[in-house]
Amino acid sequence: NQDLPVIKCVLINHKNNDSSVGKSSSYPMVSESPEDLGCALRPQSSGTVYEAAAVEVDVSASITLQVLVDAPGNISCLWVFKHSSLNCQPHFDLQNRGVVSMVILKMTETQAGEYLLFIQSEATNYTILFTVSIRNTLLYTLRRPYFRKMENQDALVCISESVPEPIVEWVLCDSQGESCKEESPAVVKKEEKVLHELFGTDIRCCARNELGRECTRLFTIDLNQTPQTTLPQLFLKVGEPLWIRCKAVHVNHGFGLTWELENKALEEGNYFEMSTYSTNRTMIRILFAFVSSVARNDTGYYTCSSSKHPSQSALVTIVEKGFINATNSSEDYEIDQYEEFCFSVRFKAYPQIRCTWTFSRKSFPCEQKGLDNGYSISKFCNHKHQPGEYIFHAENDDAQFTKMFTLNIRRKPQVLAEASASQASCFSDGYPLPSWTWKKCSDKSPNCTEEITEGVWNRKANRKVFGQWVSSSTLNMSEAIKGFLVKCCAYNSLGTSCETILLNSPGPFPFIQDNIS
């Protein structure tokens, strides 16, 4: 063992910015920090075979497999992948270790498999085996957490049936409204499945794994709060658990809470109560209504009553299938170049949606905010005043929804010109879409005031990339204008732009652009 070289195998995970196939490299690209792969001599193998930890990467990920060899003298090497030999250029680092790298850019199924590196040093020959596979994220799931009562205890368990197993955390807040935002100092997070402190104002449970994060809020009616203008509504799918918490605070313990569904008291076993004294010696009571697996007949008005507070209700609606309700008609907007503006979509959905905003084939993160009336809203303000088509797409487990928006930016036309042997064309993307005039410049009309009306053809076309309209005007060449300078002008309510073209040869000869406001 003392005679064997000290081998270190590492994996370098790259930020993707290129696409290629696996290639042997002497200098891998700039990257993240190397991860040790625990290279060890493979037990019971014939010959000296080192093996690196099995590598599992996402599709399209870019990685470098790297070997550092602490052995005296020069080394030569060869990579073999699927019976093909790949060249290998070792180099030496500052510690005089031999460094051999294999860069795999944009990982695909064809690049998965066994990579063998054969190294020959002055002292010995040995092989290093890397096994690279693609992570099967198709098996990954992230399900919204739900609540269960802990056996024989007044506590809630948060469960999320996800793969890989998620980290579950409770997110607690004792303030109202905005101060309960995720990163607010009023928010306390507890990374555990069981929660005993159930008296807080706002209680959520979140589960997170490689796919992201999903949260469920404990639906609460607070009898000390002024009721919402619209009745709070809770949607559930058949088979899901129902949990509603009724909370009330009073100066002393002399009050009780009860739950009713459509004026009938809930059955024993479908509720439990907890009470505590707060710091100012007032009594807090909470009464949970719960159904472990809801059916259609659990739909209705759930009313929490107190002997010392006005009653409040919530409408529980049990649906067979999830839904997304919103108007999907497309909307067009016209704004000034520096006007502040946001697209917005108001929707009602269950389960909660995942959404994206897309412009020019680029996706942007989508944020949703719950409104008091049971609706949610998603806004998009990051359009940077680029005209075109914007798409809002939302989906949940059962439904999909797409809405199109067109954004037009009011601006003066800008003209581009080109000429061929038979015609001259001008293009403009100003908005409102411009109108066109063509003028001939001659001895008689040095200021180009002689209007051309014959042989002019105007059209508007959609520039596909942005879903943005472009207007164009084409002048067919006639003997009357050949050899002359012509001027095309685009004008709208915000101004005029012109371009001058010489019509004497096939090549485009645009002259000075005139901007006339």
């Epitope: 040790d36 625990g38 060890a40 037990p43 599992e56």
Partner: antibody, heavy 123, light 107 residues
Framework: QVTLKESGPALVKPTETLTLTCTVS??????????VSWIRQPPGKALEWLAH???????SYSTSLKSRLTISKDTSKTQVVLTMTNTDPVDTATYFC???????????????WGQGIMVTVSS | DIQMTQSPSSLSASVGDRVTITCRAS??????LNWYQQKPGKAPKLLIY???SLQSGVPSRFSGSGSGTDFTLTISSLQPEDFATYYC?????????FGQGTKVDIK
């Protein structure tokens, strides 16, 4: 270089929950088949394997302690957390975390260890 | 659960001695056995894996042998830094189990 470091309370009261964190560096629980394991050693006694968690989320627990243990890893991939509920004075021990390397068809348990953290369970 | 029985539980030896420690499994564990060395107040250190493979950086005076149920760790010529406690570990089946340890001290 590969390092593992345990952190958590030095003292817990009986029946309380013990939460220990192992922070790793030099390798990740993300792109390679790696696992982090917890092992304990009561004063003057032998080592006892408790649990481990692999990069893909796969977990295993000691049979005798399974009902009291939960192992999880942070999505940031640098921390592994072990929680032990309903602690008892017999749980007084030095708790170590150690790395397991997973190869194509074999495992190499505990090639690197943390320095250990002494936990006393006492009222 | 598989029981791992180490013998002897302690032994006294001198520098230069050949030392042998055995580990017996209560059932077949193939070659899924590792040996670790632990010094007081320190974490264990991997010496041998898969019954006979020497971990990188470990001196060649350490060797391992055996398969099935009977395994041996041999130190061919004991050095002053080898006085420590040695543990075997089986990882053939869950739960993984360690032997009770063998303490090697100076005669």
């Amino acid at each position: 270089q590969v390092t593992l470091k345990e952190s958590g309370p030095a003292l817990v009261k009986p029946t309380e929950t013990l939460t220990l964190t192992c922070t790793v560096s030099g390798f990740s629980l993300s792109n390679a088949r790696m696992a982090v394991s917890w092992i304990r050693q009561p004063p003057g006694k032998a080592l006892e394997w408790l649990a481990h968690i692999f990069s893909n989320g796969e977990k295993s627990y000691s049979t005798s302690l399974k009902s009291r243990l939960t192992i999880s890893k942070d999505t940031s991939k640098t921390q592994v957390v072990l929680t032990m509920t309903n602690t008892d004075p017999v749980d007084t021990a030095t708790y170590f975390c150690a790395r397991i390397v997973g190869y194509s068809d074999w495992l190499l348990p505990f090639d690197h260890w943390g320095q250990g953290i002494m936990v006393t369970v006492s009222s | 659960d598989i029981q791992m029985t180490q013998s002897p539980s302690s032994l006294s030896a001198s520098v230069g001695d050949r030392v042998t420690i055995t580990c017996r499994a209560s059932q077949n564990i193939n070659r899924f056995l590792n040996w670790y060395q632990q010094k007081p107040g320190k974490a264990p250190k991997l010496l041998i894996y898969a019954a006979s493979s020497l971990q990188s950086g470990v001196p060649s005076r350490f060797s391992g042998s055996g398969s099935g149920t009977d395994f041996t760790l041999t130190i061919s010529s004991l050095q002053p830094e080898d006085f420590a406690t040695y543990y075997c570990l089986q990882h053939n089946s869950y739960p993984w189990t360690f032997g009770q340890g063998t303490k090697v001290d100076i005669k």
